[in-house]
């Protein structure tokens, strides 16, 4: 779809008469009337198959015509098609001079034609504006035309249709050819896949919009690249989703078993040592001078008995010294290494005690890790999910999510292409090794049948007497061309009467 | 045990503001991404906000996007919700909530409510 | 925004009663499902999560079972307790949704 566009610039008529030599009086009142055509090597008489426009007289014997596009005039003169323009055309325009105010052919004496000119080529679609000048014996025209594109309509014929458009099914504008060009921010054939945040993690997030990084299940911050623990876990942090490591001090499965009151709770006073005996429990050993539970109270040196588990109170000018017996350290001889008896095994491991009770090991039954049992043992460590699937380490069946175009336990089978029905009205699909083909039904185009195309209203032969079809895709009808002697809209008729337009 | 104390909740007129706060024990705070989460009188729940634990980063439902902030100071254990140019229907039970948009919300408060009307 | 449709919106049951109640997603959620309680004046509790995974401390009578689009919460022998405001919530996709809610009265 397009526009022939003719733009009358001059016209000489120095005389003021007509084709016939004749004066016109008072002056010739000239206007124009324009056929365009298919191309003819001998420009003959017969249909305008392009169009026809005719111009308000413009002037009178000799005028120069006023660009009047910008103020919703008629010049450039607008002809329009609605078919691939075929690059060649004939041209005929005629000159006329207008006695009274009704310019139509009926109304018109036979000999007021003052000027005809026909012209025939090869044209190009194109902003640039070919300049023309004919010249007759008692006339001259000046004038430029050229053939652009409708709007949405691109390519060499004007032929390929492209709508710009920022919706769900494509964010894009066109390209002079007539190739979609993304908008910013979005990717693919059509333009509706996002390019998510720059650094966003290919497996763990996902974007609806450009520049986001929504996270998958499991997953938190702006890139999408650290964990979220348990929902149980209490003070515990995670390596992937859904673990619960626990901080220091802090045991059992969701991290809620206080190993460490000393440190969380601060209890005993005086500036008194600490030391955990057990979950919730703990020893405070007091300074020289102070004695109770919680060294609250004051006393003397090494009458308090400072020294913890067996340990002797040596005094000294500064204080006092605790000697410890083995298997203790520490200020007040208050640190012991864990052993079995504290039940430090989580999970059903069992312990056993090495090196003569000093330290012991713990052994982890099926699906549990880590020196204490406190892990659980991860399913996706060995990643076993091909072509990219997501690797999920919960849930009672499914391990893995596929990416699309996949399925089975471990993403390992393609899904047919063809299983979502890609191919629009109607279109039968065909999966091919790497991706897919639409046959479409007759009227439809393009990859995936979604673009309609016109059917050829000239393939039933509907003209008659050797006559010339030309389809109307817009309309998806036909115009026949008739051979000499011949009329109608399928030149049926031999001629018998005039033709109502006078070529 | 996990305890979640929400605060700050009362009648606002149309166009004002309002700042929520959440004291957050008995778990690291540190570690989790938290959210908000409110319910109309009489209606159903309805995710407002969320923030990551690793990093701050912040979600908004679309109708609060622009008037609400979530923010969080770990070192007090609290989060915050900033509510300004509040509207007749921001009116509802706000709770705050252990979570991120794409996992359970295991903990809530006992819920602060917010009353926009003139 | 994914869709949640609970089913029904109010149901009556006795004591004893097998109950069960249903969360229809509009599209596929995989198993990234949680139900949530929640008492007249008092915040939701999470009962399960990932679907059939019961939360700590919740009683094992509670049981939750689908995958994709469909799920059930199943409550095997009512307790008075139990009577409350039941809420299906997906967080597979951003913004994380709620069901409309189903209310379990006593009959």
């Known amino acids: 779809s397009g526009v022939f566009q003719l733009q009358l610039q001059e016209f000489i008529n120095e005389r003021g008469v007509l084709a016939s030599g004749r004066p016109c009086e008072p002056g010739c009142r000239t206007f124009f009337r324009v056929c365009l055509k298919h191309f003819q090597a001998v420009v003959s008489p017969g249909p305008c198959t392009f169009g026809t426009v005719s111009t308000p007289v413009l002037g009178t014997n000799s005028f120069a015509v006023r660009d009047d596009s910008s103020g919703g005039g008629r010049n450039p003169l607008q002809l329009p098609f609605n078919f691939t323009w075929p690059g060649t055309f004939s041209l005929i325009i005629e000159a006329w001079h207008a006695p009274g105010d009704d310019l139509r052919p009926e109304a018109l004496p036979p000999d007021a034609l003052i000027s005809k000119i026909a012209i025939q080529g090869s044209l190009a679609v194109g902003q640039n504006w070919l300049l023309d000048e004919q010249t007759s014996t008692l006339t001259r025209l000046r004038y430029s035309y050229r053939v652009i594109c409708s709007d949405n309509y691109y390519g060499d014929n004007c032929s390929r249709l492209c709508k710009k458009r920022n919706d769900h099914f494509g964010h894009y504008v066109c390209q002079p050819d007539g190739n979609l060009s993304c908008l910013p921010g979005w990717t693919g054939e059509y333009c509706q896949q996002p390019i998510c945040l720059s650094g966003c993690h290919e497996q763990n997030g996902y974007c609806s919009k450009p520049a986001e990084c929504l996270c998958r299940p499991g997953w938190q911050g702006r890139l999408c690249n650290e964990c979220i623990p348990h929902n149980g876990c209490r003070h515990g942090t995670c390596s992937t989703p859904w673990q619960c490591t626990c901080d220091e001090g802090w045991g059992g499965l969701f991290c809620d078993q206080d190993l460490n009151y000393c440190t969380h709770h601060s209890p005993c006073k005086n500036g008194a040592t600490c030391s955990n005996s057990g979950q919730r429990s703990y020893t405070c050993t007091c300074r020289p001078g102070y004695t109770g539970v919680d060294c609250e109270l004051e006393l003397s040196e090494c009458d308090s008995n400072p020294c913890r588990n067996g340990g002797s109170c040596k005094d000294q000018e500064d204080g006092y010294h605790c000697l410890c017996p083995p298997g203790y350290y520490g200020l007040h001889c208050e640190h012991s290494t864990l052993s079995c008896a504290d039940s430090p095994c989580f999970n059903g491991g069992s312990c056993r005690e090495r090196n003569q009770g000093a330290n012991y090991a713990c052994e982890c039954p099926p699906n549990f890790t880590g020196s204490n049992c406190e892990k659980k043992v991860d399913r996706c460590t060995s990643n076993p999910c091909a072509n990219g699937g997501q690797c999920l380490n919960r849930g009672p069946s499914r391990m893995c999510r596929c990416r699309p175009g996949f399925t089975g336990t471990y993403c390992e089978l393609h899904v047919s292409d063809c299983a979502r029905n890609p191919c629009a009205h109607g279109g039968t699909c065909h999966d091919l090794e790497n991706g897919l083909m639409c046959t479409c039904p007759a009227g439809f185009s393009g990859r995936r049948c979604e673009v309609r195309t016109s059917i050829d209203a000239c393939a039933s032969s509907p003209c008659f007497n050797r006559a010339t079809c030309y389809t109307d895709l817009s309309t998806d009808t036909f115009v026949c061309n008739c051979p000499y002697g011949f009329v109608g809209s399928r030149c049926e008729f031999p001629v018998g009467l005039p033709p109502s337009f006078p070529w | 045990e996990v305890q979640l104390v929400e605060s700050g909740g009362g009648l606002v007129q149309p166009g004002g503001s309002l700042r929520l706060s959440c004291a957050a024990s008995g778990f690291t705070f540190s570690n989790f991404p938290m959210a908000w989460v409110r319910q109309a009188p009489g209606k159903g729940l309805e995710w407002v906000a969320t923030?990551?634990?690793?990093?701050?980063?912040?979600y908004y439902r679309d109708s609060v996007k622009g008037r609400f902030t979530i923010s969080r100071d770990n070192a007090k254990n609290s989060l915050y919700l900033q509510m300004n140019s509040l509207r007749a229907e921001d009116t509802a039970v706000y709770y705050c909530?252990?979570?991120?948009?794409?996992?359970?919300?295991?903990?809530w408060g006992q819920g602060t409510l917010v009353t926009v009307s003139s | 925004d994914i869709q949640m449709t609970q089913s029904p919106s109010s149901l009556s049951a006795s004591v004893g009663d097998r109950v069960t109640i249903t969360c229809r997603a509009s599209?596929?959620?995989?198993?990234?499902l949680a139900w949530y309680q929640q008492k007249p004046g008092k915040a939701p509790k999470l009962l399960i999560f990932d679907t059939s995974d019961l939360a700590d401390g919740v009683p094992s009578r509670f049981s939750g079972s689908g995958s994709g689009t469909d799920f059930t919460l199943t409550i095997s022998s009512l307790q008075p307790e139990d009577f409350a405001t039941y809420y299906c919530?997906?967080?597979?996709?951003?913004?994380?949704?709620f069901g409309q809610g189903t209310k379990l009265e006593i009959k």
């Open positions: 909530a252990r979570g991120y948009y794409n996992s359970p919300f295991a903990y």
């Open positions: 923030i990551s634990s690793s990093d701050g980063t912040t």
């Open positions: 919530q997906q967080y597979d996709y951003y913004p994380p949704t």
């Open positions: 599209q596929d959620i995989y198993i990234n």
